[in-house]
Interface confidence: low
Amino acid sequence: MAPWPELGDAQPNPSKYLEGATSQQPITPDKSKETNKTDNTEVPVTKFELLPTYSTATLIEEPTEVDDPWNLPTLQDSGIKWSERDAKGKILCVFQGIGRLILLLGFLYFFVCSLDVLSSAFQLVGGKMAGQFFSNSSIMSNPLLGLVIGVLVTVFVQSSSTSTSIVVSMVASSLLTVRAAIPIIMGANIGTSITNTIVALMQVGDRSEFRRAFAGATVHDFFNWLSVLVLLPVEVATHYLEVVTQLIVESFHFKNGEDAPDLLKVITKPFTKLIVQLDKKVISQIAMNDETAKNKSLVKIWCKTFTNMTQMNVTVPSMANCTSHSLCWTDGIQIWTMKNVTYKENIAKCQHIFVNFHLPDLAVGIILLIISLLVLCGCLIMIVKILGSVLKGQVATVIKKTINTDFPFPFAWLTGYLAILVGAGMTFIVQSSSVFTSALTPLIGIGVITIERAYPLTLGSNIGTTTTAILAALASPGNTLRSSLQIALCHFFFNISGILLWYPIPFTRLPIRMAKGLGNISAKYRWFAVFYLIIFFFLIPLTVFGLSLAGWPVLVGVGVPVVFIIILVLCLRLLQSRCPRVLPKKLQNWNFLPLCMHSLKPWDAVISKFTGPFQMPCCCCCRVCCRVCCLLCGCPKCCRCSKCCQDLEEGQEAQGVPVKAPETFDNITISREAQGEVRAPDSKTECTAL
């Protein structure tokens, strides 16, 4: 296979589109795209750079041997060997390494903090609405409604622990049965997987990187969706989760202990509480039909209060309003009670940015949402950049081998289970599956971890978050201990059941195949990633929610035909790929349908039309100060990846302006070399291969 795809009659005069490079650098193909090294001959002649518009778009035929896009890239070492360095170079290299490590930890810290703030922002924007979802009485009788409420609430508050704790308090106060709570917990499990999918979107700049990152993130989504697809009907039919967990809860005589350890929060809380502090009880109160809570702000103003108590006679409408430890009596006209009236005295205000602004929750939420997404984006880019510069050569080889290699035969099958344990352990340490899977996403993107290895790590993360919930349940007060423990155990066994369904037998690892499929589509049509996010986490749940409110007949009336069509399409798809001869000629492919119904190409054209005007300013901006601008807008390679840049280049080309911008599928390392940016090895060179 040739290092470069051949151009078959691409242009009448190719020399017009080739520009001689002054430096005598060999054309070195990027290893991430090319694994066959047989044609890697270095010719010290004037190098030609393929200009963007015609480099790949005019290919007439595909190369005969196509590289697997899922193969991990070989991260080339641009540094010189440790042994070849002088003393000054070695010292500099060590300091450079320490500097990188400090920067990496710093950005990781802010990355985790921004996730925390993002959760707060979502709670401010959608928390009250999420709370109101719970106060819908139909949840009791409709498990499907419970499921979508779990999804929507978790998506809106960006925290499965918040939605779970609301469920726990509702079960504890008999507003919800454990049976009705189980589908909500399943939904919360799905909802929590949106965070790392959002994080994956930040890596949209590089196609191959995005392909891996998005697939690595959505493997979590598919696992959760598929688990629910199978286990929700099973639970509705058998109530196995409810029965098993009830037996466990009843067989132990639990004593509520100390609080679950806050490990990562210890470091992040001092910073995040300077940004915003929320009174999360408000969401729970709304969920429990407390009318007064609807007017309360989620933003905490007073952090130190003094409560003074005094007793006084008050009248109450009925005995239902009698407070604890007080006696109710009647004078024949009214019911009286001796009430402890509490006077709350505010002593000290909270020390966060928004304490004195008195802005509405929505405004604070939107501000924080924008800021946290920008910080998240910036940190992610920097983490990827630092990791990219560190993980090269031998270091990369060692790390990749350590993470992705299986145990020797016959214990290879154990590797995945160890990964599950590692994922669970790491999640337990950081106390959040979102944080762990979000940190994993860029590593999958840059090719340090394969999707096959990320999958068990993600499954472990699902387990880890439930062990945290179990610990938190054991630490809860007596009146909520039983319900919170049972719900935490339901969550735990749901994930265990999911793992048993979709992991032990390689054939059943459907989420990996589905995620890779979605990764391929999203790499080709990047808008589809956002489309997927909106459809799966918002539109479908909201539609089901709306139909459920309309009642079972409407839900069944709409749902059955939809499900029937989906099954029909899947069966047809299976037959087309496995045994097409069984089908009539017309049904052997999808060409009998209009193009827009079986291809994303026409949709891509429509979406490009709409997004075009927004891309142009970005590209023009990149022309001026590409490096700085791209870092800020969170798109380190936007000069090369957006359609409008290609169009812009074509326009300039027509006017005789030579433009040097790498094409969509070219790799940054090639273009740097092409532009003569390869420095001579000196003591200041990047040092990674020791």
């Epitope: 239902a320 604890s324 430890h325 006696l327 009596w329 009647t330």
Partner: antibody, heavy 121, light 107 residues
Framework: EVQLVESGGGLVQPGGSLRLSCAAS????????MHWVRQAPGKGLEYVSG????????FYVDSVKGRFTISRDNSKNTLYLQMGSLRAEDMAVYYC??????????????WGQGTMVTVSS | DIQMTQSPSSLSASVGDRVTITCRAS??????LNWYQQKPGKAPKVLIY???SLQSGVPSRFSGSGSGTDFTLTISSLQPEDFATYYC?????????FGQGTRLEIK
């Protein structure tokens, strides 16, 4: 151990008086509402009277109003029921009971063993 | 006053049986209904309060349900120690009133 022990019951003539006491131990007596409940031989339970934790609010069932007085001494952890103008229908086992499961103040979670009051000529 | 009516006034059952006792209030008492168990010569003991909350230390075979005016106490699998008299009590309005009791005997 949380405990309530009644005393002061006995035989009394109609129109006579009797003072029942209930000694509490094992819990913060001054935090709880206390009640008297009675049970006539072979009959069901009947609520008699209650007193708030501080002792300044009381409640009586109509049939004993004006004849019985409930009081408490928080320093001694003791509840009292002063019964006067006793009638034959007042003959019962008198139980002292603690009220106040959180959120359910008129639930009697701790009961004494009871003391028998016999009204007979 | 709110009248509480229990049914049946007595019933015979065997060990392992599922038993249901009902209690009806003369007016709506929301969920403010409590259940007590009393054994001969002993003081009553609270089993369930506010319709369905199980008092600590009470076996989970006891459960309560209902709201408004109709309530039930269910013993899922009768044990020898469960043979006693059961009372319902409303704590919604003064004066507090009890049901007349249901005597549960061994068949």
């Amino acid at each position: 151990e949380v405990q309530l022990v009644e005393s002061g019951g006995g035989l009394v003539q109609p129109g006579g008086s009797l003072r029942l006491s209930c000694a509490a131990s094992g819990f913060t007596f001054s935090s709880y509402v206390m009640h008297w409940v009675r049970q006539a031989p072979g009959k069901g339970l009947e609520y008699v009277s209650g007193v708030s934790s501080s002792g300044d609010s009381t409640f009586y069932v109509d049939s004993v109003k004006g004849r019985f007085t409930i009081s408490r001494d928080n320093s001694k952890n003791t509840l009292y029921l002063q019964m006067g103008s006793l009638r034959a229908e007042d003959m019962a086992v008198y139980y002292c009971a603690r009220g106040g499961i959180t959120g359910a103040p008129l639930v009697f979670d701790i009961w004494g063993q009871g003391t028998m009051v016999t009204v007979s000529s | 006053d709110i009248q509480m009516t229990q049914s049946p006034s007595s019933l015979s059952a065997s060990v392992g049986d599922r038993v249901t006792i009902t209690c009806r209030a003369s007016q709506s008492i929301s969920r403010f209904l409590n259940w007590y168990q009393q054994k001969p010569g002993k003081a009553p003991k609270v089993l369930i309060y506010v319709t369905s909350s199980l008092q600590s230390g009470v076996p989970s075979r006891f459960s309560g349900s209902g709201s408004g005016t109709d309530f039930t106490l269910t013993i899922s699998s009768l044990q020898p120690e469960d043979f006693a008299t059961y009372y319902c009590q409303q704590s919604y309005n003064t004066p507090i009133t009890f049901g007349q009791g249901t005597r549960l005997e061994i068949k």
